[in-house]
């Protein structure tokens, strides 16, 4: 055991900066710090074979396995996968440790199973095992938390039905409006799945696990804020509990609260009472109202009142079936190159969506950000002002949304001319779609101005580039015109673009493609 | 280098609920097939093998404490939280963390790697 | 739940000894069973895994042997350094349990 050289095996995770990974020792991964596998003799194995604790990757993921050997001497070795031999390449670190990689780019099924190393040291021959597997991710899930009265105690719990386990966190704030975003001082975050501290005023839950976040608000009316100018609206889904939070203060504790249901009073069971007295000795009182597993006929107005504010209400719908409301009719925008400009969808639905932007087959994140009419927004600002088509997609469990844009940037007409043997075409981006002259250079006529009518053929929009238009126009060759210079030029509201080319002339001169604007 | 670092209170009260936190370095459970246990050690006395977390989120526990135990973890922090209710005098103990890797061909080679440990003392 | 009985509890050595520790499975636990030094104050410390395999930078005076229900760790040449506590470890099924553990003291 002493003779034997110290190994050790080590994954590296690569995050794919870009699609086009190749496998050259300078592809545009960013790294992740190497992570031990804890290799270790293989007990009862015929020869040396030392074996690394299976890894288990997404599908897609770039790897490396590597393995450090602190033997003296130079090293020689080889991969085999499958059956094949790879190429290997040992070289040695700062600390003379001789190192041999194997890089794995955008993990695939076929990329799967055990990769064996055999190494040749000047003291002794030895194996390696890595045994690489694709996680199984079909099975993930992450739900929406919901809450739960804690049995004999005035506390919620949070639950998240989830896989992987999620952490459970509560996300506490005492500020109003702006100042509850997430990453603000004024939010507390207390990773634990009980909550006794139910007085804040914004108070949410968030789970998450590999597959992201999620969180649930608890619903709150307070009755010493001025009332929305609509309704508060809740919705849930048959079977989901309902959870609404009445909060007062007052001056002394000589006030109670009460919760109606389409004004009669909710049954026993059904609301529990909490009373404090804040810092500056007034009394805060909250009243949850509860149902474990709503149904139907758990729809309608809940009012909260109080003996000393004016009672405010909700409307609780419960629906058979999660919805996204919202016109998903097309929409074209044209903007000038430096205006300002997002697009925006303004949409209700139930359960929260997952949304996503995309713009020429590249995706961007989306925010969501709730009015107080019920409605949420999503805002896209970041299309650099480059013209075509953007998508914008949103999903729950229960329904899906498209809605497409369609984005122009006013601008001057840019031209790109092309010629061969028997035509010359010209193409340009510009917006609004240009209108095209084509002109023959002579001596009769060296400013260009002879107009060539006969043999040109305009295609408004010829091919879409991510939603992009492009317009040409083509000039078929007649011997009136072979071996003269010709100008072709695009003209919208904006101005105008040329491009001169010499056509192919049947005499001694070579064809050739001249840019003279 | 792989480290394992236990923290957490040192003294707590009878019946109030112990947090132990593992906070590890260089492997990871996210993908690795690797495990975490707790294991603690009452002065003078023998280890104590408490809970195991597997990178697949799968947990086991000790029969006699399974009641009291909860073990979770957070992959993104690389860390093993233990939490251990309704504390007891008798449950005064240095209390460590350590890693189990698992091989594909079906063997294990137990704890290769363990924390310092963290004593903790319950009193009133 | 598989008990683990090791023996003896305490032993009395001198330098340069052989000594042997003992650990039995109330259950057949194959070779899935590993030995562990400690030293006051500090963590355990893997010798032995797979019941004979000797962990990497072990001294190889340390060696272990056993299947099933009976194992043993030898020392074959005791030094000043070895004198600490030996545990064995079952880790073939949940919940895992450790042996009593084997005091090695200087005689």
């Known amino acids: 055991n002493q003779d034997l050289p110290v190994i050790k095996c080590v994954l590296i995770n690569h995050k794919n900066n870009d699609s086009s990974v190749g496998k050259s020792s300078s592809y545009p991964m960013v790294s992740e710090s190497p992570e031990d596998l804890g290799c270790a003799l293989r007990p009862q194995s015929s020869g040396t074979v030392y074996e690394a604790a299976a890894v288990e990757v997404d599908v897609s993921a770039s790897i490396t396995l590597q393995v450090l050997v602190d033997a003296p001497g130079n090293i020689s070795c080889l991969w085999v996968f499958k059956h094949s031999s790879l190429n290997c390449q040992p070289h040695f670190d700062l600390q003379n440790r001789g190192v041999v990689s194997m890089v794995i780019l955008k993990m695939t099924e076929t990329q799967a199973g055990e990769y064996l190393l055999f190494i040749q040291s000047e003291a002794t021959n030895y194996t390696i095992l890595f045994t690489v597997s694709i996680r199984n991710t079909l099975l993930y899930t992450l739900r929406r938390p919901y809450f739960r009265k804690m049995e004999n105690q005035d506390a919620l719990v949070c639950i998240s039905e989830s896989v992987p386990e999620p952490i459970v966190e509560w996300v506490l704030c005492d500020s109003q409006g702006e100042s509850c975003k997430e990453e603000s001082p004024a939010v507390v975050k207390k990773e634990e799945k009980v909550l006794h501290e139910l007085f804040g005023t914004d108070i949410r839950c968030c789970a998450r696990n590999e597959l992201g976040r999620e969180c649930t608000r608890l619903f709150t009316i307070d009755l010493n804020q001025t009332p929305q100018t609509t309704l508060p609206q809740l919705f849930l889904k048959v079977g989901e509990p309902l959870w609404i939070r009445c909060k007062a203060v007052h001056v002394n504790h000589g006030f109670g609260l009460t919760w109606e249901l389409e004004n009669k009073a909710l049954e026993e069971g059904n609301y529990f009472e909490m009373s404090t007295y804040s810092t500056n000795r007034t009394m805060i009182r909250i009243l949850f109202a509860f149902v474990s597993s709503v149904a139907r006929n758990d729809t309608g107005y809940y009012t909260c009142s109080s003996s000393k504010h004016p009672s405010q209400s909700a409307l609780v719908t419960i629906v058979e079936k999660g919805f996204i409301n919202a016109t998903n009719s097309s929409e074209d925008y044209e903007i000038d190159q430096y205006e300002e400009f997002c697009f925006s969808v303004r949409f209700k639905a139930y359960p929260q969506i997952r949304c996503t932007w995309t713009f020429s087959r590249k995706s961007f994140p989306c925010e969501q950000k709730g009015l107080d009419n019920g409605y949420s927004i999503s805002k896209f600002c970041n299309h650099k002002h480059q013209p075509g088509e953007y998508i914008f997609h949103a999903e729950n469990d229960d329904a899906q949304f498209t809605k497409m844009f369609t984005l122009n940037i006013r601008r001057k007409p840019q031209v790109l001319a092309e010629a061969s043997a028997s035509q010359a075409s010209c193409f340009s981006d510009g917006y609004p779609l240009p209108s095209w002259t084509w002109k023959k250079c002579s001596d009769k006529s060296p400013n260009c101005t002879e107009e060539i009518t006969e043999g040109v053929w305009n295609r408004k929009a010829n091919r879409k580039v991510f939603g992009q238009w492009v317009s040409s126009s083509t000039l078929n060759m007649s011997e009136a015109i072979k071996g003269f210079l010709v100008k072709c030029c695009a003209y919208n509201s904006l101005g105008t673009s040329c491009e001169t080319i010499l056509l192919n002339s049947p005499g001694p001169f070579p064809f050739i493609q001249d840019n003279i604007s | 280098q792989v480290t394992l670092k236990e923290s957490g209170p040192t003294l707590v009260k009878p019946t109030e609920t112990l947090t132990l936190t593992c906070t590890f370095s260089g492997f990871s459970l996210r993908y690795a097939r690797m495990g975490v246990s707790w294991i603690r050690q009452p002065p003078g006395k023998a280890l104590e093998w408490l809970a195991h977390i597997f990178s697949n989120d799968e947990k086991s526990y000790s029969t006699s404490l399974k009641s009291r135990l909860t073990i979770s973890k957070d992959t993104s922090k690389s860390q093993v939280v233990l939490t251990l209710t309704n504390m007891d005098p008798v449950d005064t103990a240095t209390y460590f963390c350590a890693r189990m890797p698992e091989y594909s061909s079906g063997w294990s080679g137990a704890f290769d790697i363990w924390g310092q440990g963290t004593m903790v003392t319950v009193s009133s | 739940d598989i008990q683990m009985t090791q023996s003896p509890s305490s032993l009395s050595a001198s330098v340069g000894d052989r000594v042997t520790i003992t650990c039995r499975a109330s259950?057949?636990?194959?070779?899935?069973l590993a030995w562990y030094q400690q030293k006051p104050g500090k963590a355990p410390k893997r010798l032995i895994y797979?019941?004979?395999s000797l962990q990497s930078g072990v001294p190889s005076r340390f060696s272990g042997s056993g299947s099933g229900t009976e194992f043993t760790l030898t020392i074959s040449s005791l030094q000043p350094e070895d004198f600490a506590t030996y545990y064995c470890l079952q880790h073939n099924s949940y919940p895992l349990t450790f042996g009593g553990g084997t005091k090695l003291e200087i005689k």
């Open positions: 797979a019941a004979s």
């Open positions: 259950q057949d636990i194959r070779n899935d």
